[in-house]
Interface confidence: low
């Protein structure tokens, strides 16, 4: 039927026009935001940061490697981003949180225990989809079993308790390169976000059979980018707005 075909084409065209319009508005909004950012930073043009520079600056961990490989940073294309977003669907965003210094952290041999994390206001307890703690374990010389413990520091109790367990796990490591290990910390993170005063930090331990700690907590020489960090995936369901 010629009429219905024509009608269908008009509808398709209408949808495409809406798509194009929507894409154009989105692009112009992004451009406007970029101009504002550049003016705040007193810059005329966007800095040209290569993938290699970013590789050096960011932790050398699997989730970040994947992100860098997935998106060519040099390609300034608004359709490629680490946010999947439009005004009608939930957006998910991955936030990488690096440890910071804290007054709360207990001192051991004059240096603070790792780690304390401060959270961006973007991270709200009911919006956390996933939270992984990533730790790097130094290479071993012989095949060995490693016992990993993640402890949450708490205010000392009457019986001397200063921490409570998040997770303990056993890993078999072979000689060669070190490994990145991730631990699910979603529940702990949600508790911290509900009660920020309970966030006194965590302690990371990864001992081999001889009692040597393999976890990189305070990177030494040649250990740049091997700090522990939190990978948090948050979701945001925006209110459906009329244009």
């Amino acid at each position: 039927n010629e009429n219905s075909e024509q009608k269908e084409n008009v509808e398709k065209e209408g949808l495409c026009n809406a798509c194009t319009w929507r894409q154009n508005t989105k692009s112009s909004r992004i451009e406007a935001i970029k101009i504002q950012i550049l003016s705040k930073l007193r810059l005329e043009t966007a800095p040209n940061i290569s993938k290699d520079v970013i590789r050096q600056l960011l932790p050398k961990a699997p989730p970040l490697r994947e992100l860098i490989d997935q998106y060519d940073v040099q390609r300034d294309d608004s359709s490629d981003g680490s946010l999947e977003d439009d005004d009608y669907h939930a957006t998910t965003e991955t936030i990488i949180t690096m440890p910071t210094e804290s007054d709360f952290l207990m001192q051991v041999d004059g240096k603070p225990k790792c780690c304390f994390f401060k959270f961006s206001s973007k991270i709200q307890y009911n919006k956390v989809v996933k939270a992984q703690l990533w730790i790097y374990l130094r290479p071993v010389e012989t095949p060995t079993t490693v016992f990993v413990q993640i402890l949450r520091l708490i205010k000392p109790m009457k019986d001397g308790t200063r921490y409570t367990g998040i997770r303990s796990l056993k890993l078999d490591m072979n000689p060669g390169t070190g490994i990145w290990q991730s631990i699910d910390v979603k529940t702990v993170l949600q508790n911290w976000l509900k009660q920020p005063e309970s966030n006194l930090g965590i302690e990371i331990k990864a001992l081999d059979e001889n009692g040597h700690d393999l976890a990189v907590t305070f990177p030494g020489p040649g250990e740049d980018g091997l700090n522990p960090f939190l990978e948090v995936k948050v979701t945001d369901t925006p209110k459906r707005s009329r244009r």
């Epitope: 051991v108 016992f147 413990q149 402890l151 019986d159 001397g160 308790t161 200063r162 921490y163 409570t164 367990g165 998040i166 997770r167 303990s168 796990l169 056993k170 331990k205 001992l207 001889n210 009692g211 040597h212």
Partner: antibody
Framework: QVQLVQSGAEVKKPGASVKVSCKVS????????IHWVRQAPGKGLEWMGG????????IYAQKFQGRVTMTEDTSTDTAYMELSSLKSEDTAVYYC????????????WGQGTMVTVSS | DIQMTQSPSSVSASVGDRVTITCRAS??????LAWYQQKPGKAPKLLIY???DLLSGVPSRFSGSGSGTDFTLTISSLQPEDFANYYC????????FGGGTKVEIK
């Protein structure tokens, strides 16, 4: 193979103190944590406290705080547990046990030391 | 203080039976839980740590499960040498033991 060897049985009077030793052999003592657990006749296991052989830092169960002292001598790879103001209810077998680190299960145990408190 | 409650306090069983012992923590202890076997006049022996990891050399008929507050020790097919006392223990921070379970011959 790591072994923990404890001192022999003791008989004490109420109000006295007892010091039990636990010698570690076959391993790096300084990387261990030594805990003390006691068991009264026909009863269950009761954790008393622990000491880090590396730092000498201690943690005691609330019940024994002020009455128990745990120490170590790294030159002889020996840990000690001293319990003061003994009462008849302190009659028990006292065990030392090794943990690989602060929060670990006790994988190696001493043979136990019987302490009898009697007037 | 976190309390560890073990049940039952005793169980009568025959060789070949499947035996299940449970342990409940009064608060979340993640998987920082161990199971021990103790025979009369002997020191306890570690069987399972991290709630489900079998210590090397322990027969595979022993298994552990659970996380958080509820834990289980299972002996799939009881052997004559398994008649003993069993204790659970939380070992995070200040350790503490459950009251024990005596596995005796029916």
């Amino acid at each position: 193979q790591v072994q923990l060897v404890q001192s022999g049985a003791e008989v004490k009077k109420p109000g006295a103190s007892v010091k039990v030793s636990c010698k570690v052999s076959g391993g790096t003592f300084s990387t261990f944590h030594i805990h003390w657990v006691r068991q009264a006749p026909g009863k269950g296991l009761e954790w008393m406290g622990g000491i880090s052989a590396y730092s000498g830092s201690t943690i005691y169960a609330q019940k024994f705080q002020g009455r128990v002292t745990m120490t170590e001598d790294t030159s002889t790879d020996t840990a000690y547990m001293e319990l003061s103001s003994l009462k008849s209810e302190d009659t028990a077998v006292y065990y030392c046990a090794r943990a690989r680190y602060v929060d670990d299960a006790f994988d190696i145990w001493g043979q136990g030391t019987m302490v009898t408190v009697s007037s | 203080d976190i309390q560890m409650t073990q049940s039952p306090s005793s169980v009568s069983a025959s060789v070949g039976d499947r035996v299940t012992i449970t342990c409940r923590a009064s608060e979340d202890i993640s998987n920082f839980l161990a199971w021990y076997q103790q025979k009369p006049g002997k020191a306890p022996k570690l069987l399972i740590y991290a709630a489900s990891d079998l210590l090397s050399g322990v027969p595979s008929r022993f298994s552990g499960s659970g996380s958080g507050t509820d834990f289980t020790l299972t002996i799939s097919s009881l052997q004559p040498e398994d008649f003993a006392n069993y204790y659970c223990q939380k070992y995070i921070s200040a350790p503490s033991f459950g009251g024990g379970t005596k596995v005796e011959i029916k």
